[in-house]
Interface confidence: low
Amino acid sequence: CPMSCKCSTTRIWCTEPSPGIVAFPRLEPNSIDPENITEILIANQKRLEIINEDDVEAYVGLKNLTIVDSGLKFVAYKAFLKNGNLRHINFTRNKLTSLSRRHFRHLDLSDLILTGNPFTCSCDIMWLKTLQETKSSPDTQDLYCLNESSKNTPLANLQIPNCGLPSARLAAPNLTVEEGKSVTISCSVGGDPLPTLYWDVGNLVSKHMNETSHTQGSLRITNISSDDSGKQISCVAENLVGEDQDSVNLTVHFAPTITFLESPTSDHHWCIPFTVRGNPKPALQWFYNGAILNESKYICTKIHVTNHTEYHGCLQLDNPTHMNNGDYTLMAKNEYGKDERQISAHFMGRPGVDYETNPNYPEVLYEDWTTPTDIGDTTNKSNEIPSTDVADQTNREHEQKLISEEDLGGEQKLISEEDLHHHHHH
């Protein structure tokens, strides 16, 4: 622990004025782990004048930094670059004449206390006035600065000509691009002092490069990946006083892919689970034994989770019987393409057939084709839900099924097994 300081596993405090410290406290190698330090308190250190760029970087877990009644005159711009956990900074009664917002812009500070410093009235500290004005808490500080006549001026009254917040404005209200294509986003910035323009692209996967010319900037994104759909891109204008940003959400359009289709599982209902990716949202259509499966309250598609351009869901079946056994194909399509995937589903054996003693009964419960297969001739009986002679009317009520209309947009008809016989035999 440095001279004139005391240390614990999580705190460093340097409050003894004599002999005092002349540099920001650093821990000796092989002593306390600096990453565990959450609080540093420095007081009465008149000879501590500077915080250098690398003084604080080791204290990555630092939350509270207090330097009061000391001689602090200068803080390096990048001093707190590695201290993303900093929440409270108190530099009360030091010798700071200027302090840039660049020191703190990446931090999510709850408190920045700066009273009792001899700030010089200039555009450099106008950001503090703006910060005070936008702060929601009523306990705003009484900050002052020294004007040209060395008179104390309340920061709240500070008027500096040509010193205001910048503005940023994107040229496009929304940004929709097809996967693999390229796009250029334009942005205009303005303000006095003239702001710098930069782009915040977050974790954008696609290759991108930017160019700035005067108050106009452009961001070129090439070979756009579908993984970037939903990401936010921001144009930021920054000057001494503060920053403004305008953001746009990137929407990437791409053809659907059925990334997952599995055999039925039974919970409250039977479910054929699937995952589909695509944008715009793909239209889903199921086929049963090669024919269109019209949905009803007994058989319907449910999307349970939507993760922007990925949809997780089920083909939900109410009380399926042996008559629902067969091949189920999911087709997903949008204006950029389509995908098909098929499984074979086996819900229960045929009544009266002991299939353990019947070697001809299929034991394969499902298969998975990742490429489209022959989905059958829809003019034959492939869209017929297989029927048996069911004598018990109460059972028959549970075995009502849908028959598909030729036209996709046609009315869905709920019919019974008996109707199915008539429909196909007359």
């Epitope: 404005r169 040229a171 496009a172 209200p173 929304n174 250029t184 334009s186 205009s188 303005g190 160019e211 010319s213 005067h214 108050t215 106009q216 452009s218």
Partner: antibody, heavy 119, light 112 residues
Framework: EVQLQQSGPELVKPGASVKISCKAS????????MNWVKQSHGKSLEWIGD????????SYNQKFKGKATLTVDKSSSTAYMELRSLTSEDSAVYYC????????????WGQGTTLTVSS | DIVMSQSPSSLAVSAGEKVTMSCKSS????????????LAWYQQKPGQSPKLLIY???TRESGVPDRFTGSGSGTDFTLTISSVQAEDLAVYYC????????FGSGTQLEIK
């Protein structure tokens, strides 16, 4: 065919407020910024502000901040501009205009709404 | 703010004549990367809404007669009507879109 149909003329008293509408048809409202422009009698055109119909985000000419409020109703494809604390200086024709190509130029305009502020 | 100045404020020509009008901006409207000038020209006939004629300083909007030509770059721009017709009686406005939007004061074209 793209059309911007504005509400009819308004005669209002000083100090009152007025809300002008602009119904878009022939295109998807959310694909383009909607701009509003003022033209006082015999004078030039002044850009008031614009709105991004997707999220309701607005930009204003500094001169009209506090005077004009822009909104949209996506369900009816209609943009609105409310003008408050009206004075005779606000008497003018007000246009809505669709912002094309990143809103750099205005390719379709409404027919204009005449506002007269008089006691 | 960018200030747009148009001249002359009005001019009268005979049908068939060539006419030019000027528009100057207080700062460059050229984006050096895209090579685009953020300037448009609009025509407003009496009792009508403005109509887009030219954008990017020189690109004619579809349906606009080819007698209308836009030219210029940076801060100085010109709208030329090669052979004025009676139906061209209107006020012509330039507008910048480099930073927000500002219109010029307009040039009134009268037919003798």
């Amino acid at each position: 065919e793209v059309q911007l149909q504005q509400s009819g003329p308004e005669l209002v008293k000083p100090g009152a407020s007025v809300k002008i509408s602009c119904k878009a048809s022939g295109y998807t409202l959310t694909d383009y910024y909607m701009n509003w422009v003022k033209q006082s009698h015999g004078k030039s055109l002044e850009w008031i502000g614009d709105i991004n119909p997707n999220n309701g985000g607005t930009s204003y000419n500094q001169k009209f901040k506090g005077k004009a409020t822009l909104t949209v109703d996506k369900s009816s494809s209609t943009a609105y501009m409310e003008l408050r604390s009206l004075t005779s200086e606000d008497s003018a024709v007000y246009y809505c205009a669709r912002g094309a190509y990143y809103s750099n130029y205005f390719d379709y305009w409404g027919q204009g709404t005449t506002l007269t502020v008089s006691s | 703010d960018i200030v747009m100045s148009q001249s002359p404020s009005s001019l009268a020509v005979s049908a068939g004549e060539k006419v030019t009008m000027s528009c100057k901006s207080s700062q460059s409207l050229l984006n050096s990367r895209t090579r685009k000038n953020y300037l448009a020209w609009y025509q407003q006939k009496p009792g009508q809404s403005p109509k887009l004629l030219i954008y990017w300083a020189s690109t004619r909007e579809s349906g606009v007669p080819d007698r209308f030509t836009g030219s210029g770059s940076g801060t100085d721009f010109t709208l030329t009507i090669s052979s004025v017709q009676a139906e061209d009686l209107a006020v012509y406005y330039c507008k910048q879109s480099y930073i927000l939007f500002t219109f010029g004061s307009g040039t009134q074209l009268e037919i003798k």
